[in-house]
């Protein structure tokens, strides 16, 4: 039979507002049928939109009856529409796109890690951290020293001395484990996780007992 | 982005004080130690000591002991050297820079310099 | 007091590679892993070019690369340009003073 165009996915179009972090990919859908098969064009704010109108261009998928955009970016926010067409009709969808700047933060550190470990003498321990950071981050494992029989300097802040950080062939998975093997009494002692990006700081601490 | 911006050039006669001012933005403050660094004309660079913006704490280098105060103001995000006492081969470029320590922890083995103001020109002469 | 030790100057042609030594002790640049370098242009303040021995920070050009062996380090640039031409400090942690540098090397780009 012929006809003029129609959704055949309805129930997936119901979300009209989207709203993105920055740099995310976005693709919006129009599901239509009709005979002759119908058209797909898009406009941005009421006008034809084309690749050549936003950096990083588009991907039209007319199989899909969709629009890709990728990297999103604040100047991508505006109303999209889908016109579907064939010589008995058009129907049409519009669609709101949001781009919200990620604030950037400090890294997160998962809750738990690293965890208080005992070990016996001579055996390998393992502590683990995991880091979430939008921007790069740079991962250190401390351990805490005395110096000159104090545990704080003249300030009151902790020694520490760095144990670990990233090598220029060290993985971020790498860095997010301690290794230490052949424990022994001088290792016990509080060992801290520190990860810092272009924001700030975090860290988590935990103690590691040697048992006889 | 993180930025240090330092006050402007200065002229001092032999014996008296200057106090160079870093103010930062771009980052948290008080998470990084404040070091300063001098260079002297057509000479290499000399490290001066830190300050830690969060505890106040400082470390100077043996040789300017006793002559140099590093001091901040946490509510401006602005740090300060003072160097007293001034002889003619004090001449040089004053840098701050901020040093990858993280401020809640004194090190006792590590540290590199990420971000430099754009230094201050300080003359000694009489 | 200059506590590493740099060759005053180098020079190599564009597009060469040329390599700029550091030597220090066992109490600074042989006991850690923790020497960085810095590119200063005339007039211009430093800026980071390495760090942790062989880490780029991001922005800075994969032809610049970091080493150490024992009490050495270097560092080493490849297919030189003529704006690689600058002033270049090494430095590292020592256990006695903190923070050393090298006395600076002059790299020239012949051309």
């Known amino acids: 039979d012929t006809g003029a165009p129609y959704w055949t996915r309805p129930e997936r179009m119901d979300k009209k507002l989207l709203a993105v972090p920055a740099a995310n990919t976005v693709r919006f859908r129009c599901p239509a049928a009709g005979n002759p098969t119908p058209s797909i064009s898009w406009l941005k704010n009421g006008r034809e939109f084309r690749g050549e109108h936003r950096i990083g261009g588009i991907k039209l998928r007319h199989q899909q009856w969709s629009l890709v955009m990728e990297s999103v970016v604040p100047s991508d926010r505006g109303n999209y529409t889908c016109v579907v067409e064939n010589k008995f009709g058009s129907i049409r969808q519009t669609y709101t796109l949001d781009v919200l700047e990620r604030s950037p933060h400090r890294p997160i550190l998962q809750a738990g890690l690293p965890a208080n470990q005992t070990a016996v003498l001579g055996s390998d321990v393992e502590f683990h951290c995991k880091v979430y950071s939008d921007a790069q981050p740079h991962i250190q494992w401390l351990k805490h020293v005395e110096v000159n029989g104090s545990k704080v300097g003249p300030d009151g802040t902790p020694y520490v001395t760095v144990l670990k950080t990233a090598g220029a062939n060290t993985t971020d998975k790498e860095l997010e484990v301690l290794s230490l093997h052949n424990v022994t009494f001088e290792d016990a002692g509080e060992y801290t996780c520190l990860a810092g990006n272009s924001i700030g700081f975090s860290h988590h601490s935990a103690w590691l007992v040697v048992l006889p | 982005q993180v930025q240090l911006v330092q006050s402007g050039a200065e002229v001092k006669k032999p014996g008296a004080s200057v106090k160079v001012s870093c103010k930062a933005s771009g980052y948290t403050f008080t998470s990084y130690y404040m070091h300063w660094v001098r260079q002297a004309p057509g000479q290499g660079l000399e490290w001066m000591g830190w300050i830690n913006p969060n505890s106040g704490g400082t470390n100077y280098a043996q040789k300017f002991q006793g002559r140099v105060t590093m001091t901040r103001d946490t509510s401006i995000s602005t740090a300060y050297m003072e160097l007293s006492s001034l002889r003619s081969e004090d001449t040089a470029v004053y840098y701050c820079?901020?040093?990858?320590?993280?401020?809640?922890?004194?090190?006792?083995?590590?540290?590199?310099?990420?971000?430099w103001g754009q230094g201050t020109l300080v003359t000694v002469s009489s | 007091d200059i506590a590493l030790t740099q060759p005053a100057s180098v020079s190599g042609s564009p597009g060469q590679s040329i390599t700029i030594s550091c030597t220090g002790t066992s109490s600074d640049v042989g006991g850690y892993n923790y020497v960085s370098w810095y590119q200063q242009h005339p007039g211009k303040a430093p800026k980071l070019m390495i760090y942790?021995?062989?880490n780029r920070p991001s922005g800075v050009s994969n032809r610049f690369s970091g080493s150490k062996s024992g009490n050495t380090a270097s560092l080493t640039i490849s297919g030189l340009q003529a704006e690689d031409e600058a002033d270049y400090y090494c430095?590292?942690?020592?256990?006695?003073?903190?923070?050393?540098f090298g006395g600076g090397t002059k790299l020239t780009v012949l051309g």
């Open positions: 942790d021995v062989s």
């Open positions: 820079a901020r040093g990858y320590w993280y401020a809640y922890f004194t090190y006792i083995n590590y540290g590199y310099f990420d971000n």
């Open positions: 430095q590292s942690y020592d256990n006695n003073s903190d923070v050393v």
